[in-house]
């Protein structure tokens, strides 16, 4: 199973089930669904003394992951005290930790309903200079609530003093307002109102709805590729309009910038498709610095037959950044594949999803048509991954047996690139005496014999060999041992393999 971080849940009793004269009380913390072991659970009991007991981990039957419970027993003035259970899982990462802060017991309560309302457009369907979002938190049992606004998952610095609470009978309602600039709203970010109440989280999210397009015609606006942006340093964006009916009227694609600054000269291409429709593309060079600094570009599509203009905008992706991890592999030789081999490259855990993948051989970039790379897909976590596949020929690896898989991504440091090298026959190319490679599994052979005969993967030591502790003069991977025959009066036989 692969590494999996735990989900952490507080374990509390109902307040009404705890006797009022109880001098001590036990609460717990459940960490579940993690792999591998161990987790470390610690408690912050504030000013109170407490004793803890962490139960041995149990295996979850279906997944093979683990679950464990830590119990804390406290005495004294526990009723008003909050307790924090801190769960660390170093196999996930050295600093992976999840804190849960909660009180000894849970009261019966009515949870809030969270709903975001947004201000209207003007009569012409255009957005005003500022947009108001109103978070309504309604119908909850009176108690402390915390409201946080998030933009694409990141906490926003918002003045919450304007939040107002009213009580209707036994239930309360609160509302909080967020004012956004038109630029922020149009940038396609997601806004979330997150409410914490009684140790639970409730939320609602909203973003600018996609325009309802005139039927049948679609427009798309691409971001520059990381390769164009960081390596060629000549980024372009492309506005693509598809499914246009050919007609006498001209399609106009007009570029603009949210800052109002002028745009570069664009190039335009029209293509008639097999199904009779027209595809129009307009490519606009953009300034590397302008793009990196977050400029928003708009493409406006007009046509006499369109009921109204189509608008598309693009800007640098916001949100957290993470550099890609890159791993490269070569497939083994199979019958019928002696003269070609497949190389693969796994690129994972990067954010945002914009990435360019290249293969290089002999310090020359191979044409994109040579390799096949998947579209970015989400990992189980918050990042993305792609696979890239390259077929190489014997002529290529005999010329130089080193192929480079390179990922270009904005979060990669220092030069926006991460690369790996892979060889078809690692360690054998060149045959340098200065750099050695432990051989594949080798049959027991005479020390006097020249050349080590290769055997199939399932070879075993000669029956009279025993496993030694590795040969100091063979600097191969440490898991390879050498078997030495102890026959008297003849040169020893050896077998190198996994003992």
């Amino acid at each position: 199973a692969s590494t999996q971080s735990p989900s952490v849940f507080p374990l509390t009793r109902c307040c009404k089930n705890i006797p009022s004269n109880a001098t001590s009380v036990t609460l717990g913390c459940l960490a579940t669904g993690y792999f591998p072991e161990p987790v470390m659970v610690t408690w912050d009991t504030g000013s109170l003394n407490g004793t803890t007991m962490t139960l041995p981990a149990t295996t979850l039957t279906l997944s093979g992951h683990y679950a464990t419970i830590s119990l804390l027993t406290v005495s004294g003035a526990w009723a008003k005290q909050m307790f924090t259970c801190r769960v660390a899982h170093t196999p996930s990462s050295t600093d992976w930790v999840d804190n849960k802060t909660f009180s000894v017991c849970s009261r019966d309560f009515t949870p809030p309903t969270v709903k975001i309302l947004q201000s209207s457009c003007d009569g012409g369907g255009h957005f005003p200079p500022t947009i108001q979002l109103l978070c309504l938190v309604s119908g909850y049992t009176p108690g402390t609530i915390n409201i946080t606004w998030l933009e694409d998952g990141q906490v926003m610095d918002v003045d919450l003093s304007t939040a107002s609470t009213t009580q209707e009978g036994e239930l309360a309602s609160t509302q909080s307002e967020l004012t956004l600039s038109q630029k922020h709203w149009l940038s396609d970010r997601t806004y979330t109102c997150q409410v914490t109440y009684q140790g639970h989280t409730f939320e609602d999210s909203t973003k600018k709805c996609a325009d309802s397009n005139p039927r049948g015609v679609s427009a798309y606006l691409s971001r520059p590729s990381p390769f164009d942006l960081f390596i060629r340093k000549s980024p372009t964006i492309t506005c693509l309009v598809v499914d246009l009916a050919p007609s006498k009227g001209t399609v106009n694609l007009t570029w603009s910038r949210a800052s109002g600054k002028p745009v570069n000269h664009s190039t335009r291409k029209e293509e008639k498709q097999r199904n009779g429709t027209l595809t129009v593309t307009s490519t606009l060079p953009v300034g590397t610095r302008d793009w990196i600094e977050g400029e928003t570009y708009q493409c406006r599509v007009t046509h006499p037959h369109l009921p109204r203009a189509l608008m598309r905008s693009t800007t640098k992706t916001s949100g957290p950044r993470a550099a890609p991890e890159v791993y490269a592999f070569a497939t083994p030789e199979w019958p019928g594949s002696r003269d070609k081999r497949t190389l693969a490259c796994l690129i994972q855990n990067f954010m945002p999803e914009d990435i360019s993948v290249q293969w290089l051989h002999n310090e020359v970039q191979l044409p994109d048509a040579r390799h096949s790379t998947t579209q970015p897909r989400k990992t189980k976590g918050s990042g993305f991954f792609v696979f890239s596949r390259l077929e190489v020929t014997r002529a290529e690896w005999e010329q130089k047996d080193e192929f480079i898989c390179r990922a270009v991504h904005e979060a990669a440091s220092p030069s926006q690139t991460v690369q790996r090298a892979v060889s078809v026959n690692p360690g054998l190319a060149g045959g340098s005496a200065q750099s050695q490679r432990a051989p594949d599994r080798v049959l027991c052979h005479s020390g006097q014999q020249q050349g080590l005969p290769r055997a199939a993967g399932g070879s075993v030591p000669h029956p009279r060999c025993h496993c030694g502790a590795g040969r100091a003069d063979w600097p191969g991977p440490p898991e390879l041992d050498v078997c030495v025959e102890e026959a008297e009066g003849e040169a020893p036989w050896t077998w190198t393999g996994l003992c």
Epitope: Y327, A328, E402, A421, P426, G427
Partner: nanobody
Framework: DVQLQESGGGLVQAGGSLRLSCAAS????????MGWYRQAPGKQRELVGR???????YYADSVKGRFTMSRDNAKNTVYLQMNSLKPEDTAVYYC????????????WGQGTQVTVS
């Protein structure tokens, strides 16, 4: 041809320091993770530490806080700075190169002897 050449080994007193170098040629150095291994007489070879191609380092518990790895991609060289040396650090030290990122060290140097008296 790929070559990994260690240097800087020698005899040093306990508590002293040494700096090992490993010069690589014939490979695209910036694409490789580099590792240092050591093998004492009669013992299994053990990993001392590794440095990823992005500069992130990992060390065995036995050397943590005493040994430091670094790399100079412009010079195609990886270094192992060894401080507070102990007699049990006596071994042949090998450098190794892994291009895949998977921990498969494809290329190995010949080793350099470090003796701590």
């Amino acid at each position: 041809d790929v070559q990994l050449q260690e240097s800087g080994g020698g005899l040093v007193q306990a508590g002293g320091s040494l700096r090992l170098s490993c010069a690589a040629s014939g490979l695209t150095f910036g694409s490789y993770d580099m590792g240092w291994y050591r093998q004492a007489p009669g013992k299994q070879r053990e990993l001392v530490g590794r440095i990823r191609n992005d500069g992130i380092t990992y060390y065995a518990d036995s050397v943590k806080g005493r040994f430091t790895m670094s790399r100079d991609n412009a010079k195609n060289t990886v270094y192992l700075q060894m401080n507070s040396l102990k007699p049990e650090d006596t071994a042949v030290y090998y450098c190794a190169a892994d291009g895949t990122g998977l921990g498969h060290y494809d290329y190995w140097g010949q080793g350099t002897q470090v003796t701590v008296s």
